[in-house]
């Protein structure tokens, strides 16, 4: 039975130009977590596996850092990268966990972090 | 078995720098983040900040922003920081450390540094 | 940024007996992680994740916790567990680590 939740970022935004981290933390179970992926829509941007480290995708290279701890540093934002991201933990003996954050890349200086909240 | 080497003790002057070494061996260089933490008596550990070597990417203290300066150089595996303007405060023996995402898992043994006037 | 309290500062314990050490943070943080440290050597990764205990770490070793309040706890003290131990968060840029608790045999 999965009894873990996730807590996220949840819905945030930042400047055009600017960075952002994206943080997920999945809490209320004693499952083991082999592996953390973040996507972009269908997009993979990173995998963190607990035996080998960090990986970057090739494409995000230049754009995407890791951390801080399993989060992710998104920097030299555009408005393109308005939408959801998704942080997905490979667990065992539970399976998958999944948090979404939903960043908006404001044009103007008016960008304002949203609160933290909770997914089953 | 992933290894952290630290350069060995600086015994520099007030006003001057220091760069030290943190040469890693037996993982991927370029999958982890490297850290780098003060330690004093009186104050404890203090984080510093930490380079990715994939990209070069550095996430500073503010606190220790212009203070120091973190690099890496991939070829040789080795992750440095420089420290300037060196005062009294900046004596301390400074750890690098190595980080995937779970905690720092593996540290080096440490650089000792004393600044005299 | 998020300061972390540790209590007790100095401890002493008898072989066998429970043990329990906190970490207090300024706001709440998702999980903490716990550094043991020996005189003259680097610290080592203890707890991580709250709860998670690092490769050859005993199983009287115990963490807990949730929002500002969390602890360490050995279930039954033993002589090699004399030491210091550090908390550290990360839910907050910086990261910041507790003054530490250090743990003396009796």
């Known amino acids: 039975m999965m009894t873990g939740t996730i807590e996220t970022t949840g819905n945030i935004s930042a400047e055009k130009g600017g960075s952002i981290i994206l943080q997920c933390h999945l809490s209320s179970t004693t499952a083991q977590v082999t592996q953390v992926n973040w996507e972009q829509q269908d997009q993979l941007l990173a995998i963190c596996n607990a035996d080998l480290g960090w990986h970057i995708s090739p494409s995000f290279k230049d754009r995407v850092a890791p951390g801080p701890g399993l989060g992710l540093t998104l920097q030299s934002l555009t408005v393109n990268d308005t939408g959801e991201y998704f942080c997905i933990y490979h667990t065992y003996p539970d399976g998958t966990y999944t948090g979404r954050i939903f960043l908006e890349v404001l044009e103007s200086s008016v960008a304002e972090h949203g609160a933290r909240f909770q997914i089953p | 078995q992933a290894y952290l080497q630290q350069s060995g003790a600086e015994l520099v002057r007030s006003g001057a720098s220091v760069k030290m070494s943190c040469k890693a061996s037996?993982?991927?260089?370029?999958?982890?983040?490297l850290h780098w933490v003060k330690q004093t008596p009186g104050q404890g550990l203090k984080w510093i900040g930490y380079?990715?070597?994939?990209?070069?990417?550095?996430n500073y203290n503010q606190k220790f922003k212009g203070k120091a300066t973190l690099t890496a150089d991939t070829s040789s595996s080795t992750a440095y920081m420089q420290i300037n303007s060196l005062t009294s405060e900046d004596s301390a023996v400074y750890f690098c450390?190595?980080?995937?995402?779970?905690?720092?898992?593996?540290w080096g043994q440490g650089t000792s540094v004393t600044v005299s006037s | 940024q998020i300061v972390l309290t540790q209590s007790p500062a100095i401890m002493s314990a008898s072989p066998g007996e429970k043990v329990t050490m906190t970490c207090s943070a300024t706001?709440?943080?998702?999980?903490m992680h716990w550094y043991q440290q020996k005189s003259g050597t680097s610290p080592k990764r203890w707890i991580y994740d709250t709860s998670k205990l690092a490769s050859g770490v005993p199983g009287r070793f115990s963490g807990s916790g949730s929002g500002t309040s969390y602890s360490l706890t050995i279930s039954s003290m033993e002589a090699e567990d004399a030491a210091t131990y550090y908390c550290q968060q990360w839910s907050s840029n910086p990261s910041t680590f507790g003054a530490g608790t250090k743990l003396e045999l009796k």
């Open positions: 037996g993982y991927t260089f370029t999958s982890y983040n």
């Open positions: 706001s709440s943080v998702s999980s």
């Open positions: 380079i990715y070597p994939g990209n070069g990417y550095t």
């Open positions: 450390a190595r980080e995937g995402g779970w905690a720092m898992d593996y």
